[in-house]
């Protein structure tokens, strides 16, 4: 798994980093959740989207959300995760054209409806952490990762390394 | 690029024991989810087990659950498959696979993005 100890290292190469290409390496529809198995939902409110934390009931089904994995340079030859000098980031739409954003003035995540190319803002690292989850590092923001706050999604400030392994942070990606 | 190659298969008596491995390069193995998947002539490929990079397990079925057990070594960047008390049934072409893209435990073939050229398994009677 990613080693903790480097991710000051890692992440201080992401404001430079600049995605190799611009199509995906692979896309997956997954459903997302977090660590403690509540569902990210996805609902469609006075015109637009809003995000919510949930438990699901017994046979609802969840939501899904595409996942498009992008090869990003890494500046460094600091050993992270993906292929020795690149990383993963990923861009995720749980409906067409619109994409996860982060606010980072609002420390919030947002759906918002964008045509390609997507801004920064839409691309989060993807970080390989412990129990097989993930977590998602903003790229305009390093150190600053989505996570679960009061049944919502909003993004987190992971200051020392151990809180890395926070569980507000951490996300199942799921078959769906 | 990731590239798989897989080692130990062979023919074996009913009960006896094999030990598969995949060694594997391209990418930092440590964060790659890696699955081992069989097929049978004239049937579909199956899943048999995986092993997420964080080391937890699931497995097809209790008879796989009971004989068979996955393992990975991240320093040697390689996947076992222990067969213990093989069955005829258990003949066929093993393949090993990767998913590079932090999936939670995939089982479904379709999940994997990386998959090895396979090695055959043959169980006697």
């Known amino acids: 798994a990613f080693g903790i100890s480097g991710v000051q290292k890692y992440t201080r190469a992401l404001h430079d980093s600049s995605i190799t290409g611009i199509s995906p390496i692979t896309e997956y529809l997954a459903s997302l959740s977090t660590y403690n198995d509540q569902s990210i939902t996805f609902a469609l409110e006075d015109e637009s989207y809003e995000i919510y934390v949930e438990d699901l009931k017994k046979d609802e089904k969840k939501d899904k959300v595409l996942l498009s994995y992008y090869e990003s340079q890494h500046p460094s030859n600091e050993s992270g995760d993906g292929v020795d000098g690149k990383m993963l980031m990923v861009t995720l739409s749980p409906t067409k054209d619109f994409w996860l954003h982060a606010n980072n003035k609002e420390h919030s995540v947002e759906l918002h409806k964008c045509e390609k190319p997507l801004p920064d803002q839409a691309f989060f690292v993807l970080h390989n952490m412990h129990s097989n989850c993930v977590s998602f590092e903003c790229k305009t923001d390093p150190g600053v990762f989505i996570g679960v706050k009061d049944n919502h999604l909003a993004l987190i400030k992971v200051d020392s390394s151990e809180n890395l392994c926070t569980e507000n942070i951490l996300f199942k990606l799921s078959e769906t | 690029q990731v590239q798989l190659v897989e080692s130990g298969g062979g023919l074996v008596q009913a009960g006896g024991s094999l030990r598969l491995s995949c060694a594997v390069s391209g990418r930092t193995f440590s964060t790659l989810n890696m699955g081992w998947f069989r097929q049978a002539p004239g049937k579909e490929r199956e899943f048999v087990a995986n092993?997420?990079?964080?080391?937890?397990?699931?497995y097809s079925s209790d008879s796989a659950k009971g004989r068979f057990t996955i393992s990975r070594d991240n320093a040697e960047n390689t996947v076992y498959l222990q067969m213990n008390s093989l069955k005829p049934e258990d003949t066929a072409v093993y393949y090993c696979?990767?998913?590079?893209?932090?999936?939670?435990?995939?089982?479904?073939?379709?999940?994997?993005?990386?998959w090895g050229q396979g090695t055959q398994v043959t169980v006697s009677s």
């Open positions: 092993i997420g990079w964080s080391g937890g397990t699931t």
């Open positions: 696979a990767a998913d590079i893209k932090g999936l939670y435990f995939p089982r479904d073939a379709r999940s994997f993005d990386y």
